[in-house]
Interface confidence: low
């Protein structure tokens, strides 16, 4: 049995983490010569038959899951992987600290702690310079992010966000940056270990010229990679609740 039309890719430029009132472009990319694209916001009736959606100003109502597909002749492709568009700056920023401190010897241990005055049950940690966003919801269940056996790769600038599993696409503003310094080794900033590299798409003003307005309300963001966490009290093996979209 041969497969169907391959699924397109859907990306947010410059990132899928979008501060409120900032712009973002969603782009669906299929093979050359596609007859028709369909880009939709899941769990809603919003859709457009265009490959590109330019959002000049991000709103709460536009946060959520998006996906796209394309049509060639009478055939529809499989749907793209779903894109989670997150509105940031919805809540006040949390604080990020390092225990025992932000300077750590190579081979030592450090724990990054994200704290908020609100009753949020989800947290996301980002390392500046890494592609965004990366989530590993099954690895962490609390607002502490232990880094065991620190290496030079862990050096860099970190930020965290807090949010609620009830509204998983509405996040706080980012914390103030925390600079993690690894001593006793040559420092070569890189991605957090165990996370696969992925390309970072660059935003171009030319993108806007290709776009079509999707709605009057509309979505940029920080480029980085994240790890999400929920509090230690959570026993769910699924990690942070992912209120489906639909990926």
């Amino acid at each position: 049995q041969s497969g169907p039309l391959p699924k397109p890719s859907l990306q947010a430029l410059p990132s899928s983490l979008v501060p409120l009132e900032k712009p973002v472009t969603l782009r669906c990319q299929g093979p050359p010569g596609v007859d028709l694209y369909r880009l939709e916001k899941l769990s809603s009736s919003r859709y457009q038959d265009q490959a590109v959606l330019f959002i000049p100003a991000m709103k709460r109502s536009l946060a959520g899951r998006y996906r796209c597909s394309y049509q060639n002749g009478s055939l529809w492709s499989l749907p793209s992987d779903q894109l989670e568009l997150v509105a940031t700056g919805v809540f006040a920023k949390p604080s990020l600290s390092a225990q025992p401190g932000p300077a750590v010897s190579s081979g030592g241990d450090v724990t990054l702690q994200c704290q908020t005055r609100y009753g949020f049950d989800q947290f996301a940690l980002y390392k500046e310079g890494d592609p965004a966003p990366y989530k590993n919801p099954e690895r962490w269940y609390r607002a502490s992010f232990p880094i065991i056996t620190v290496t030079a790769a862990h050096s860099g600038t970190y930020r965290c966000y807090s949010f609620s599993s009830r509204d998983p696409y509405l996040w706080s503003a980012p914390s103030d940056p925390l600079e993690l310094v690894v001593t006793g080794t040559s420092v070569t900033p890189s991605r957090l270990p165990t996370e696969p590299p992925s390309p970072v798409a660059e935003f171009s003003e030319a993108t806007a010229e290709l776009t079509v307005s999707f709605t009057n309300e509309v979505f940029t963001t920080e480029t980085s990679r994240s790890i999400t966490a929920s509090p230690k009290e959570s026993d769910s093996p699924a990690g942070p609740a992912r209120q489906y979209y639909t990926k």
């Epitope: 049995q1 497969g3 169907p4 699924k7 939709e40 899941l42 769990s43 009736s45 859709y47 597909s69 529809w76 499989l78 749907p79 992987d81 779903q82 989670e84 990366y134 989530k135 590993n136 919801p137 099954e138 696969p196 699924a238 990690g239 992912r242 489906y244 979209y245 639909t246 990926k247």
Partner: antibody, heavy 114, light 106 residues
């Protein structure tokens, strides 16, 4: 050629945990998601959950509290773990590629019994 | 969660005949429905996705239609090898299978 192959324990005691591995070939887990589906004896298909290319997961709401799906991209393997098994979990378990599940494995039979 | 009500649960038809199976969703699924054929001892096979898009290699006597909450799947010129259980699947919001339809040949 796209292929998926499930491997499991066959027999599991009640209240114990179930672990099943889906080994795939012909496509990359970095880009494609994998679903888990089961079929109890003489009953229909039931979707359990999915792990996406980026590692994020979704679960059937009634099973979310005792289900965990993970993967190892480098080994082309996806893992299903289900806790607190009862005899109602006796079924044939399948893994299937992405949405809307265009390729399936042959399934592995799991019996929950003491 | 979205519920899918599939009917009938079983049906019998003659070779060369035509059968139709329906699935009703508990809410609008925006054409995100697929149909599968499942034979004993095998994994299910995808026949149709996105309501009416036929998988490559699937005979054109299989077809699908519908919109909103109501969808149907038909087999024309029924063949002996079509004996199987057929399932609908919605993939608009999480995934939910219909209860299945067991097809027998008279």
């Amino acid at each position: 050629q796209v292929q998926l192959q499930e491997s499991g324990p066959g027999l599991v005691a009640p209240s114990q945990s179930l672990s099943i591995t889906c080994t795939v070939s012909g496509f990359s887990l970095t880009y494609y998601g994998v679903n888990w589906v089961r079929q109890p004896p003489s009953r229909g298909l039931e979707w359990l959950g999915m792990i996406w290319g980026d590692g994020s997961t979704d679960y059937q709401s009634t099973l979310k509290s005792r289900l965990s799906i993970s993967k190892d991209n480098s080994k082309s393997q996806v893992f299903l773990k289900m806790n607190s098994l009862t005899t109602d979990d006796t079924a044939r378990y399948y893994c299937a590629r992405d949405l809307p599940m265009d390729y399936w494995g042959q399934g592995t039979s799991v019996t929950v019994s003491s | 969660d979205i519920q899918m009500t599939q009917s009938p649960s079983s049906l019998s038809a003659s070779v060369g005949g035509r059968v139709t199976i329906t699935c009703k969703a508990s809410q609008d699924i925006n054409k995100y429905i697929a149909w599968y054929q499942h034979k004993p001892g095998k994994g299910p096979s995808l026949l149709i996705h996105y309501t009416s898009t036929l998988q490559p290699g699937v005979p054109s006597r299989f077809s699908g239609s519908g919109s909103g909450r109501d969808y149907s799947f038909s087999i024309s010129n029924l063949q002996p090898e079509d004996i199987a259980t057929y399932y609908c699947l919605q993939y608009a919001l999480l995934l939910t299978f219909g209860g299945g339809t067991k097809l027998e040949i008279k």
